[in-house]
Amino acid sequence: LFGKLHPGSPEVTMNISQMITYWGYPNEEYEVVTEDGYILEVNRIPYGKKNSGNTGQRPVVFLQHGLLASATNWISNLPNNSLAFILADAGYDVWLGNSRGNTWARRNLYYSPDSVEFWAFSFDEMAKYDLPATIDFIVKKTGQKQLHYVGHSQGTTIGFIAFSTNPSLAKRIKTFYALAPVATVKYTKSLINKLRFVPQSLFKFIFGDKIFYPHNFFDQFLATEVCSREMLNLLCSNALFIICGFDSKNFNTSRLDVYLSHNPAGTSVQNMFHWTQAVKSGKFQAYDWGSPVQNRMHYDQSQPPYYNVTAMNVPIAVWNGGKDLLADPQDVGLLLPKLPNLIYHKEIPFYNHLDFIWAMDAPQEVYNDIVSMISEDKK
């Protein structure tokens, strides 16, 4: 189906700012420095193509990408299909975040990305340092006390952690829009599952201790489990699609070159190992450092603490997919009753994990709802 790519999209070689301005939208690019020294690129689309004249404060919407991804996820389709552009055109002040370790967040004040120390993080640190630093920056820059948070995949995970453990940060979130939410991964059918067969003592032997490059680890599972489903030498070598799954029917195949050139955007081996721990335990908890002594050093307890989403009082709207391999409907089913302020839920039976960011019908299925919910919030 996608045997050959004709390099038709100029965004293939562009950075985030170039992608935004290519479509005629205004762009502001900032660097946010976290408490532990990571330098994260943050982009702003302050208004849309047709509403620059509207004065007054626009509601702020912050978009946070998922696992192995980056801010380009929100701008990889044509403007009428990309959530960031749709929100900007609807009159909102749109901000795009990046998590440490991805293409646009691979610098640190103290460590080089060539060092092991740079890569000693998982989604715990993204929640503890990246989100507060970025949200604080946006609040200061816009002068607005609250913002709307849209997370996809791991972007929801770090939201659950940050907003349940950091009450002052939670106060800054007007509404949390969770697309393909991931807390537990007890029932995941993603190939991330296969990583659980790698013993802890061998994980770094196989994958190293810096950036996560799966090399050919997944090859032994692909032929039977993924690639025989009518696809496709191209997607079968891409870690994002391997781990998240894909849906040929819902993809705009002419944009595939953009998706593949910007993904996977990179994360740490430690982060992938944390996800592996979560698959094994079936629990939503902090990184297990491997021994009671080391856990005590980090957490003052011998076991990593559990994350308690019931402590998150932020109003939350949830969209999940019935065919999602990573955010399995059973795991979402465990999550929903624990959310004390669930204001909306929709399961899209035929959606998989990446459909929420790239599906051709995402505006009809998801984005239009978000736009109208934010506008209701304004009143």
């Epitope: 060092s115 092991v116 120390e117 013993p199 802890q200 003592s201 061998l202 770094k204 032997f205 190293g208 201790d209």
Partner: nanobody, 120 residues
Framework: QVQLQESGGDLVQAGGSLRLACAAS????????MGWYRQVPGKQRELVAA???????YYVNSVKGRFTISRENAKNTVYLQMNSLKPEDTAVYYC??????????????WGQGTQVTVSS
């Protein structure tokens, strides 16, 4: 200077067996993990089997039930017992050891490789 030296590679008939050995010298630490990779000309080097210093093992699907990895921690030596060999097992087999004095100084150390040829 840490060095890894493989031995045991040979030409063998399909269905036959071989035992590869890899010995480390010059190391002031014991490896956290050791293992075997293989490479066919024109293809990427691929993991075959690995063993941690806690004894935990990992095998790729294609060799499960046929190959067994073991190690002698005291000697920093790792073995690969290969049974029921198939022509597709033909490759250069490389030994890898991973270790360091601290978690931030861990490195991968590689041997020079030993040729295994399985004829049909």
């Amino acid at each position: 200077q840490v060095q890894l030296q493989e031995s045991g590679g040979d030409l063998v008939q399909a269905g036959g067996s071989l035992r590869l050995a890899c010995a480390a010298s010059g190391s002031t630490f014991s490896f956290n993990a050791m293992g075997w990779y293989r490479q066919v000309p024109g293809k990427q080097r691929e993991l075959v089997a690995a063993i941690g210093n806690d004894g935990s093992t990992y095998y790729v699907n294609s060799v499960k039930g046929r190959f067994t990895i073991s190690r002698e921690n005291a000697k920093n030596t790792v073995y690969l017992q290969m049974n029921s060999l198939k022509p597709e097992d033909t490759a250069v087999y490389y030994c890898k050891g991973r270790g360091g004095l601290t978690q931030y100084s861990e490195h991968d150390y590689w041997g020079q490789g030993t040729q295994v040829t399985v004829s049909s």
